[in-house]
């Protein structure tokens, strides 16, 4: 078997709200994969599972099921949001992410996403994790690779 | 330490309206929420609304939204509750209180203030 | 609104005794940001309620570790290991999960 490549793209959109009342934010981020199958045989994406992270702290968990075959030498992008949450410890947050004096609220997030694939029977697992810059105080939809955190930082592959 | 001053007691006549004061000291004003809460002699406590002392941003109980108007002035740190058209169901003791950073519980009382609706 | 019922409406005890008061309430008391905002006070006569333990089991500052706090979605439990005379008075659980924000009926704690 060949290899099926993941490819962590960047977040394509982040909404948010807030319970004033509560100083929480809710952030929905949505993420984009490019999942691409190097075989001349279909796999199946079994399911993806990701997990976001502020300040080593988990802020949010998705887990999508039964998601797209993929047929041979084929690519295909996948999106997937992560609802989150950053309340309690962390309501700090909520002063600097409803400031108006300043324009852009950006935080520094860590994606951390693992995709199944399974093909004749045999399961495989692949994950990426990247840091990510996510507005938190206003709705934002990013040119793919826009909301890129420092290179520098990021983890090897 | 955290203080919130409130007069004793307001004696006031039924249809007329009463203004309460609750005046903060020991912290910052606007960082906290302002809660009113109403309590009938002997029995439970009732929660009418909430004030950010920061825009003046209010939060009421529906069964109080004609009844209490909640104001701040934050040059003498000072919150305030209007009841109007006061009637007997009225007399009662009004706790104002401070929120928690999360605005959700009340770590802090003031005294109350009695309120007595009589003729 | 969220109704709050307090059970026993009174508790006689003897001091020494452990005392334990049940607070349940008419729906689930989780917020959407997976806190449970529920809290107990002890109001003594003629003052003002005090803050006993905030967020379901947490003892706020100066309370006595005797005093603690249980209980999760609508079931809620306010323990004294211990009952001094210091201790008597009325007991209210709240919560301020849902707009409005409401209490319990109370509970009044008195010597047997």
């Known amino acids: 078997p060949r290899s099926i490549d993941v490819k962590y793209i960047g977040v394509k959109s982040a909404y948010v709200s807030y319970d004033v009342q509560k100083r929480t934010i809710y952030l929905n981020i949505t993420n984009t994969l490019n999942i691409t199958n190097n075989n001349y045989y279909s796999v199946e994406v079994e399911n993806i599972t990701a997990q976001v992270q502020f300040s080593k702290t988990v802020i949010g968990k998705a887990r999508l099921n039964n998601i797209t075959i993929i047929g041979p030498l084929d690519m295909k992008q996948i999106d997937y949001t992560v609802p989150t949450v950053i309340a309690e410890e962390m309501s700090y947050m909520y002063d600097f992410c409803t400031l108006i004096s300043i324009k852009v609220h950006n935080i520094v997030l860590m994606m951390q996403v693992t995709v199944t694939t399974t093909y004749f029977g045999h399961s495989e697992q692949i994950s990426q994790e990247r840091y990510q810059y996510v507005d938190c105080g206003r709705n934002t939809t990013y040119q793919l690779g826009q909301s890129e955190y420092l290179n520098v930082l990021q983890p090897q592959q | 330490q955290v203080q919130l001053q409130q007069p004793g007691t307001e004696l006031v006549k039924p249809g007329a309206l009463v203004k309460l004061s609750c005046k903060a000291s020991g912290y910052t004003f606007t960082t906290y929420w302002i809660h009113w809460v109403k309590q009938r002699p002997g029995q439970g406590l009732e929660w009418i609304g909430n004030i950010n002392p920061s825009n003046g941003n209010t939060k009421n109980n529906e069964r109080f939204k004609t009844k209490a108007t909640l104001t701040v002035d934050k040059s003498s740190s000072t919150a305030y509750m209007q009841l109007s058209s006061l009637t007997s169901e009225d007399s009662a003791v009004y706790y104002c209180?401070?929120?928690?950073?999360?605005?959700?519980?009340?770590?802090?009382w003031g005294q109350g203030t009695l309120v007595t609706v009589s003729s | 609104d969220v109704v709050m019922t307090q059970t026993p409406l009174s508790l006689p005890v003897s001091l020494g005794d452990q005392a334990s008061i049940s607070c349940r309430s008419s729906q689930s008391l989780v917020h959407s940001n997976g806190i449970t905002y529920l809290h107990w006070y002890l109001q003594k006569p003629g003052q003002s309620p005090k803050l006993l333990i905030y967020k379901v089991s947490n003892r706020f500052s100066g309370v006595p570790d005797r005093f603690s706090g249980s209980g999760s979605g609508t079931d809620f439990t306010l323990k004294i290991s211990r009952v001094e005379a210091e201790d008597l008075g009325v007991y209210f659980c709240?919560?301020?999960?849902?707009?409005?924000?409401?209490f319990g009926g109370g509970t009044k704690l008195e010597i047997k």
């Open positions: 709240s919560q301020s999960t849902h707009v409005p924000y409401t």
């Open positions: 209180v401070r929120g928690d950073y999360y605005g959700t519980s009340y770590p802090f």
